[in-house]
C-alpha cells in the first residue's frame, strides 16, 4: 500500500488505478495515504473514472476517508440514486490527511479502465464554518497560510484560550445622581469568560436605589445557585445576590452612597443579561417657603442633597439679609437635611432720604418722608436767583434703589444762578459818575492783593477779571482777598471768598501791551446768590447787536475818582461805545506804541472826556443790557487807557469778552 508523499515534501501528485489507462485487473486493492502540513488540507479531483457499477458500490469502488470519517465511496461512471460517481466533484480532507482505497472484486462483466486523480495540499480557511457550527472565533477571525488567529472588538480582550473575547468591563465609575448600566452588549447576548465590575459612587449623604428593568436573563442551573454566570451587588453594609435566571430581581434600596456591581460569566451559554436603572435619594431639606413679595424657583415636590432653589423678588422689592442687600440668592440642600443659607426677605426698595440740593429744596409728593419704590419727590430751586438746569426736578424711586429723573438721570439736578439781574434800570445818562445803590451791580467783586482791582462774578464760583490785575498772584491764588455783596470798599460787612486757582489767558504777556487781558479766578467754595450777589451773564452770540458804536455800557468800580483817591462807595458811569477805528487812531500817537488797540479790545467813553474808568477799576465789568432777555451781560473788562483818566480825545479800553467765550467755557468745564 503506497503511503504517498509526506510533508515537508511538496504535497501534490497523481493517483491512478493499476494498469491505467488500460483496464484494471480483478481482486485488486490499493491504498494511498496523503499527509499535508499542519493547517493545510488535501484537495482531490478525478480526471477519469470508470469502475464497475454495483448496488451501493459493493463490487468495485474507490473510498475516500479522512481520519475516521468516510468522505465518499465511488463507483460506476455516473451517479445514480444509490451510487455515486465523482463526476466533476472536488473532495477535501477534513484534516491534514487523506486515505484513498481502490478495490476490485473477483469479476467484471466487461472491461473497466479505472480512474485517474490529482491531488494537492491547500491552506485550510479555519474562519469558514458550516452553518450551525460554532464560529472559530468570538469576534474576528483572520486566516493565514497554515493557520488562523482571533482578535476582539474594542472593549474586549482575547482570553487565554485564544478564541474567546472577554469583555473589558471593569473600572467604570458612575457619579451622577441617576443613570443606567447593563451587561455588555445588552440586549444582545453577553460575552463569555468575562468578569465585570461597576461602581456607583455618589457624594456622602446620598443613598443609591437599584431597579432591574426590561429583562433579566443570566445562565442558571436548576439545582445549584448560579454556578455558571452570576451578578452580585456589594455595599459597605451588605451583599446582595448572587442573581441569575430569568426573573427580574426586586428593587434594592442600598442605604449607601457607594455600590459595587460584579458580573461574572463562564465559557458557554447564550443569554441576554441585565439592565439596571439607578436613582438616589437623600434626607430632604425643609420645604422652602417664599418670603412675602418673592417666589421660589424651581418649584419641586421635595429638595434633597445638592438640590437648590433661588429667591426672586417682585419688581420694586429687593433681597435683604437683615440690612444687607443681595443681588441674588441661591440656597443649597446639605447632607444633614439643612439649607446652607438662611432665607432672605424681599423688602420694598427704599431709595432713602433724597440728597440735599444746593440752592434748592426737595418736596415729598407721595407723602411726608415716603422714600420707597415709586415714591415721587420734586426738587426746586430757590426762586428769583436760581433756575433749574438739566431736568424738571421730578424724581421717582425706581426698582434699582436710585432716585431717577424722567430723563433717566440718577444725578441731582443743578440749581444754576440766574445771571444779569440788577435793581437798576438804565436811563441812558452819560454824564457824571454816580454812586451805586444796593442791588445795582450785584456781580461786582472787590479784589485785594497788593493792589485794588475788581472783577465780575460768573455762575457762583468763578470771577472774571483782567489778567494784569491778578498776574502777580497767579502762582499764589490764596493771597487774593475776594469780597462781594458790599457797596462800601472799607465796610466790614461783605461776603468773603477765597481763590482756589487763577487762570490767565495764555496769549497775555505782562508789561508788553494788554492784548488778551483776561483771567478767571476759581473760588474754593460756591457763594450764596441773593439780591446783592448775583452773577453777570456772558454775552450771547447775538450780543454784538447791543454793543454797536454809541450803544451805552456801564462801568462800575472803586477806582480813582476825579479827586485822585479810591472811591469809598461803589461808583458807576454810563458810557458809549466808541468806533474802533477812531479809538485805534487815538492811541497811535506817542507815547503809545503802534498797534496798542487790537481786535480783542473795545473802547468806550466821551470824546470830550470826563467819564471813564480808572486805576482800581481794573478787571471790573463793562456791562450792557440785553433788551431781549432783559438781563445784563459783560461786554468788556476794564483793561487800560490814557495816563490821565477821563482825558479828552482818549478812551477807556476794555477786553472784548465776546472774543473769549470758547476760552471761558473751556476753563470752566475743565475745572
Amino acid at each position: 500500500t503506497p503511503l504517498g508523499p509526506k510533508w515537508p515534501e511538496p504535497v501534490f501528485g497523481r493517483l491512478a488505478s493499476p494498469g491505467f489507462p488500460g483496464e484494471y485487473a480483478n481482486d485488486q486493492e490499493r491504498r494511498w495515504t496523503l499527509t499535508a502540513p499542519p493547517g493545510y488540507r488535501l484537495r482531490l479531483y478525478f480526471t477519469h473514472f470508470d469502475l464497475e457499477l454495483s448496488h451501493l458500490c459493493e463490487y468495485d469502488f474507490v473510498k475516500l476517508s479522512s481520519g475516521a470519517k468516510v468522505l465518499a465511496t465511488l463507483c460506476g461512471q455516473e451517479s445514480t440514486d444509490t451510487e455515486r460517481a465523482p463526476g466533476k466533484d472536488t473532495f477535501y480532507s477534513l484534516g491534514s490527511s487523506l486515505d484513498i482505497t481502490f478495490r476490485s472484486d473477483y469479476s467484471n462483466e466487461k472491461p473497466f479502465t479505472g480512474f485517474e486523480a490529482f491531488y494537492a495540499a491547500e491552506d485550510i480557511d479555519e474562519c469558514q464554518v458550516a452553518p450551525g457550527e460554532a464560529p472559530t472565533c468570538d469576534h474576528h477571525c483572520h486566516n493565514h497560510l497554515g493557520g488562523f488567529y482571533c482578535s476582539c472588538r474594542a472593549g474586549y480582550v482575547l482570553h487565554r484560550n485564544k478564541r474567546t473575547c472577554s469583555a473589558l468591563c471593569s473600572g467604570q465609575v458612575f457619579t451622577q445622581r441617576s443613570g443606567e448600566l447593563s451587561s455588555p452588549e445588552y440586549p444582545r447576548p453577553y460575552p463569555k469568560l468575562s468578569s465585570c465590575t461597576y461602581s456607583i459612587s455618589l457624594e456622602e449623604g446620598f443613598s443609591v436605589i437599584l431597579d432591574f428593568v426590561e429583562s433579566f436573563d443570566v445562565e442558571t442551573h436548576p439545582e445549584t445557585l448560579c454556578p455558571y454566570d452570576f451578578l452580585k451587588i456589594q455595599t459597605d453594609r451588605e451583599e446582595h445576590g448572587p442573581f441569575c435566571g430569568k426573573t427580574l430581581p426586586h428593587r434594592i434600596e442600598t442605604k449607601s452612597n457607594t455600590v459595587t456591581i460584579t458580573f461574572v460569566t463562564d465559557e458557554s451559554g447564550d443569554h441576554t443579561g441585565w439592565k439596571i436603572h439607578y436613582t438616589s435619594t437623600a434626607q430632604p431639606c425643609p420645604y422652602p417657603m417664599a418670603p412675602p413679595n418673592g417666589h421660589v424657583s424651581p418649584v419641586q415636590a421635595k429638595y434633597i442633597l445638592k438640590d437648590s432653589f433661588s429667591i426672586f423678588c417682585e419688581t420694586g422689592y429687593e433681597l435683604l439679609q437683615g440690612h444687607l442687600p443681595l443681588k441674588s440668592f441661591t440656597a443649597v440642600c446639605q447632607k444633614d437635611g439643612s439649607w446652607d443659607r438662611p432665607m432672605p426677605a424681599c423688602s420694598i426698595v427704599d431709595c432713602g432720604p433724597p440728597d440735599d440740593l444746593p440752592s434748592g429744596r426737595v418736596e415729598y409728593i407721595t407723602g411726608p418722608g415716603v422714600t420707597t419704590y415709586k415714591a415721587v419727590i420734586q426738587y426746586s430751586c430757590e426762586e428769583t436767583f436760581y433756575t433749574m438746569k438739566v431736568n424738571d426736578g421730578k424724581y421717582v424711586c425706581e426698582a434699582d434703589g436710585f432716585w431717577t429723573s424722567s430723563k433717566g438721570e440718577k444725578s441731582l439736578p443743578v440749581c444754576e444762578p440766574v445771571c444779569g439781574l440788577s435793581a437798576r434800570t438804565t436811563g441812558g445818562r452819560i454824564y457824571g459818575g454816580q454812586k451805586a445803590k444796593p442791588g445795582d451791580f450785584p456781580w461786582q467783586v472787590l479784589i485785594l492783593g497788593g493792589t485794588t482791582a475788581a472783577g465780575a462774578l460768573l455762575y457762583d464760583n468763578w470771577v472774571l477779571t483782567a489778567a494784569h490785575a491778578v498776574y502777580e498772584q497767579k502762582h499764589d491764588a490764596s493771597a487774593l482777598d475776594i469780597r462781594m455783596g458790599t457797596l462800601k470798599r472799607l465796610s466790614p460787612h461783605y461776603t468773603q471768598a477765597w481763590s482756589e486757582a487763577v487762570f490767565i489767558h495764555e496769549g497775555y504777556t505782562h508789561d508788553a501791551g494788554f492784548d488778551n487781558d483776561i483771567a478767571l479766578i476759581k473760588l474754593n467754595n460756591k457763594v450764596v446768590i441773593n439780591s446783592n450777589i448775583t452773577p453777570i451773564c456772558l454775552p450771547r452770540k447775538e450780543a454784538e447787536s447791543f454793543m454797536r458804536t454809541d450803544d451805552i455800557g456801564t462801568a462800575s468800580g472803586w477806582g480813582l475818582t476825579q479827586r485822585g483817591f479810591l472811591a469809598r462807595n461803589l461808583m458807576y458811569v454810563d458810557i458809549p461805545i466808541v468806533d474802533h477805528q477812531k479809538c485805534t487812531a487815538a492811541y497811535e500817537k506817542p507815547p503809545y506804541p503802534r498797534g496798542s488797540v487790537t481786535a480783542n479790545m473795545l473802547c468806550a467813553g466821551l470824546e470830550s472826556g470826563g467819564k471813564d474808568s480808572c486805576r482800581g477799576d481794573s478787571g471790573g465789568a463793562l456791562v450792557f443790557l440785553d433788551s431781549e432777555t432783559e438781563r445784563w451781560f459783560v461786554g468788556g473788562i476794564v483793561s487800560w487807557g490814557s495816563m490821565n483818566c477821563g482825558e479828552a480825545g482818549q478812551y477807556g479800553v476794555y477786553t472784548k469778552v465776546i472774543n473769549y467765550i470758547p476760552w471761558i467755557e473751556n476753563i470752566i468745564s475743565d475745572f
Epitope: 442687600p325 443681588k327 443659607r341
Partner: antibody
Framework: DVQLQESGPGLVKPSQSLSLTCTVT?????????WNWIRQFPGNKLEWMGY???????SYNPSLKSRISITRDTSKNQFFLQLNSVTAEDTATYYC???????WGQGTTLTVSS | DIVMTQSQKFMSTSVGDRVSVTCKAS??????VAWFQQKPGQSPKALIY???YRSSGVPDRFTGSGSGTDFTLTISNVQSEDLAEYFC?????????FGGGTKLELK
C-alpha cells in the same frame, strides 16, 4: 479666593480728609453683596462705618453721615472711604469687609495727629 | 442704635472644655447675628452668620444659637488655637453694631 486689601496714609493731620482704598481680588464688587468699611479703635471696639452695595447704593452709620462718603471704581474693582474733618478720635485700624463680614482685609492703621 | 452687650469681658477655660459666649441685643434682631474671632495683630475672622450658619472652613466644634435678643456661641471642645477674643454683631438694621468682645483665656 476672595481677597481684600486696604491702602492709605498712616498719618493724617486733624481737620484734614482721610482717603482709603480697598482693592478686591477674586470677586467682582458688582457681582453681589455689600462692601463695608469697619474700624477698630484702640481697646478693640469695632464700629461699622458704612457700605456700598453691588449696585452702587450706599448706607452710612448715622453717627458719621455728615463726614463720610463711600465710592467705587468698578474698572479697578476698588471701593473707597473718604472721611472729612478728622480728629484724634478717628485714630483706629480701618478694615474693609464683604457682606456681613465673611471676608476681611488685613487692616490699615491710621493715626490722626498734628 | 441697637446695642449688643457681651456681659463677660473675659472667660477662663481649659483645653477640651465646652464654653458658651453670650450676647444680648437691646431690641429684636431676628436671627441676623454674626460671630467673629480675633487674635492679636490679626483681622477678625468670620465664624457664624445668621445665628447658626457656620462660615466656610470653620470647625464644627463652633456652633451658634438663639433668636430675637439672646444669642450664644458655643465651643464644644476648646483647642489652644481657640484662645482669642470673640465679637458678636447684628446686621439687622442700620447701623450694624458689634458687641464689646469676650476674651477667652486659659485657666
Amino acid at each position: 479666593d476672595v481677597q481684600l486689601q486696604e491702602s492709605g496714609p498712616g498719618l493724617v493731620k486733624p481737620s484734614q480728609s482721610l482717603s482709603l482704598t480697598c482693592t478686591v481680588t477674586g470677586y467682582s464688587i458688582t457681582s453681589d453683596y455689600a462692601w463695608n468699611w469697619i474700624r477698630q479703635f484702640p481697646g478693640n471696639k469695632l464700629e461699622w462705618m458704612g457700605y456700598i452695595s453691588y449696585s452702587g447704593r450706599t448706607s452710612y452709620n448715622p453717627s458719621l453721615k455728615s463726614r463720610i462718603s463711600i465710592t467705587r471704581d468698578t474698572s479697578k474693582n476698588q471701593f473707597f472711604l473718604q472721611l472729612n474733618s478728622v480728629t484724634a478720635e478717628d485714630t483706629a485700624t480701618y478694615y474693609c469687609a464683604r457682606y456681613w463680614g465673611d471676608y476681611w482685609g488685613q487692616g490699615t492703621t491710621l493715626t490722626v495727629s498734628s | 442704635d441697637i446695642v449688643m452687650t457681651q456681659s463677660q469681658k473675659f472667660m477662663s477655660t481649659s483645653v477640651g472644655d465646652r464654653v458658651s459666649v453670650t450676647c444680648k441685643a437691646s431690641q429684636n434682631v431676628g436671627t441676623n447675628v454674626a460671630w467673629f474671632q480675633q487674635k492679636p495683630g490679626q483681622s477678625p475672622k468670620a465664624l457664624i452668620y445668621s445665628t447658626s450658619y457656620r462660615s466656610s472652613g470653620v470647625p464644627d466644634r463652633f456652633t451658634g444659637s438663639g433668636s430675637g435678643t439672646d444669642f450664644t456661641l458655643t465651643i464644644s471642645n476648646v483647642q489652644s488655637e481657640d484662645l482669642a477674643e470673640y465679637f458678636c454683631q447684628q446686621f439687622n438694621s442700620n447701623p450694624l453694631t458689634f458687641g464689646g468682645g469676650t476674651k477667652l483665656e486659659l485657666k
